[in-house]
Interface confidence: low
């Protein structure tokens, strides 16, 4: 499976859109900072079979999509930027799905690392709970936006390593 240059471009565009979505200075939100315990070990990528890594990346994209496609999210961000963000994420998910099928065949399901998938789910659950506790305040969303940028950077790095393996 070849995660193409187009996919790489999608990644960069996703990160760029996330950066553009910033509405307030992160420095005005220092008191709201929070450690969401990003499951970095799941993105180190050395212990993975390729199909497993792709599955974890797909889960990351799916959960990011879910997070930013809620009513609370559309109230918090610029709609045009959000729409573009959805398109980029959706495209990435499609690419990754095609990759899983190519890697393991349509009929087979890879022996994916369930632990990793659940770790990503749990990470996003922590983010959702934080937003709820902070009543979806502008600062809470800014903290989350910065966090998602960070996690998408890890995803991008893992994808680069996967491309190098091709």
């Amino acid at each position: 499976c070849n995660l193409s240059q187009t996919h790489s471009l999608n990644n960069r565009r996703t990160l760029m859109l996330m950066a553009q979505m910033r509405r307030i200075s992160p420095f005005s939100c220092l008191k709201d900072r929070h450690d969401f315990e990003f499951p970095q070990e799941e993105f180190d990528g050395n212990q993975f079979q390729k199909a497993q890594a792709i599955s974890v990346l797909h889960e990351m994209m799916q959960q990011t999509f879910n997070l930013f496609s809620t009513k609370n999210s559309s109230a918090a961000w610029d709609e045009t930027l959000l729409e573009k963000f959805y398109i980029e994420l959706f495209q990435q998910m499609n690419d990754l799905e095609a990759c899983v099928i190519q890697e393991v065949g349509v009929e087979e399901t890879p022996l994916m690392n369930e632990d990793s998938i659940l770790a990503v789910k749990k990470y996003f659950q922590r983010i959702t709970l934080y937003l709820m506790e902070k009543k979806y305040s502008p600062c809470a969303w800014e903290v989350v936006r910065a966090e998602i940028m960070r996690s998408l950077s890890f995803s991008t790095n893992l994808q680069k390593r996967l491309r190098r393996k091709d």
């Epitope: 799916q62 879910n66 399901t109 994916m112 369930e114 632990d115 998938i117 659940l118 789910k121 749990k122």
Partner: antibody
């Protein structure tokens, strides 16, 4: 083949505790999360929580946090669930089910243990 | 938590009849994580359909699953006596994982 063995029944008194077991065989015990599910007579299924046998990490349904405690014993490849301060509401069949992904998710279940809480 | 509502609670169908069971989610569920289980009295549940539309091993081809977002369904194209059972939908899209209350399918 994959098997999850559970005792058939447990009769316990109100206020007491009970420790249910689920013995795994036919696969690498530490590679899959073990889940527990409750079913009251003639009713639906409720997810209680899960435990990763590899390092003992647990995730609970908030509704069961003060009721259930999940543990494993790697040497006997057995998962356990302790239920405390039992009441008639806890009378139910308790299943263990093995995690996995895709077609492996909850593809294997124990036969269930019927817990009856009665004086 | 995501509440799954199944309807009808009980239904009976004649042999050869087409049957559709529905599962409605209180909030959106990723279709990859929407599953169906079949349970017969005195037995543990059996995985029946995974990821919305994929039949588990050994499930007859007369069964199918479909749906997305908050609306899912299980269809039997032609009811047979052995299909009489309870069917539960289940999501593990987000914590806590939840099950529907079930549909008891009887044969007329």
């Amino acid at each position: 083949q994959v098997q999850l063995q559970q005792p058939g029944a447990e009769l316990v008194k109100p206020g007491a505790s009970v420790k249910l077991s689920c013995k795994a065989s036919g696969y690498t015990f530490t590679n899959y999360w073990m889940h527990w599910v409750k079913q009251r007579p003639g009713q639906g299924l409720e997810w209680i929580g899960e435990i990763n046998p590899s390092h003992g990490r647990t995730i609970y349904n908030e509704n069961f946090k003060s009721k259930a405690t999940l543990t494993v014993d790697k040497s006997s490849i057995t998962a356990f669930m302790q239920l405390s301060s039992l009441t008639s509401e806890d009378s139910a069949v308790y299943f263990c089910a093995r995690g996995g992904l895709g077609p492996a998710w909850f593809a294997y279940w124990g036969q269930g243990t019927l817990v009856t809480v009665s004086a | 938590q995501i509440v799954l509502t199944q309807s009808p609670a009980i239904m009976s169908a004649s042999p050869g009849e087409k049957v559709t069971l529905t599962c409605s989610a209180g909030s959106s569920v990723d279709s990859s994580y929407l599953y169906w289980y079949q349970q017969k009295p005195g037995s543990s549940p059996k995985l029946w359909i995974y990821s919305t539309s994929n039949l588990a091993s050994g499930v007859p081809a007369r069964f199918s699953g479909s749906g997305s977002g908050t609306s899912y369904s299980l269809t039997i194209s032609s009811m047979e006596a052995e299909d009489a059972a309870s069917y539960f939908c289940h999501q593990w899209s987000s914590y806590p994982f939840t099950f529907g209350s079930g549909t008891k399918l009887e044969i007329k």
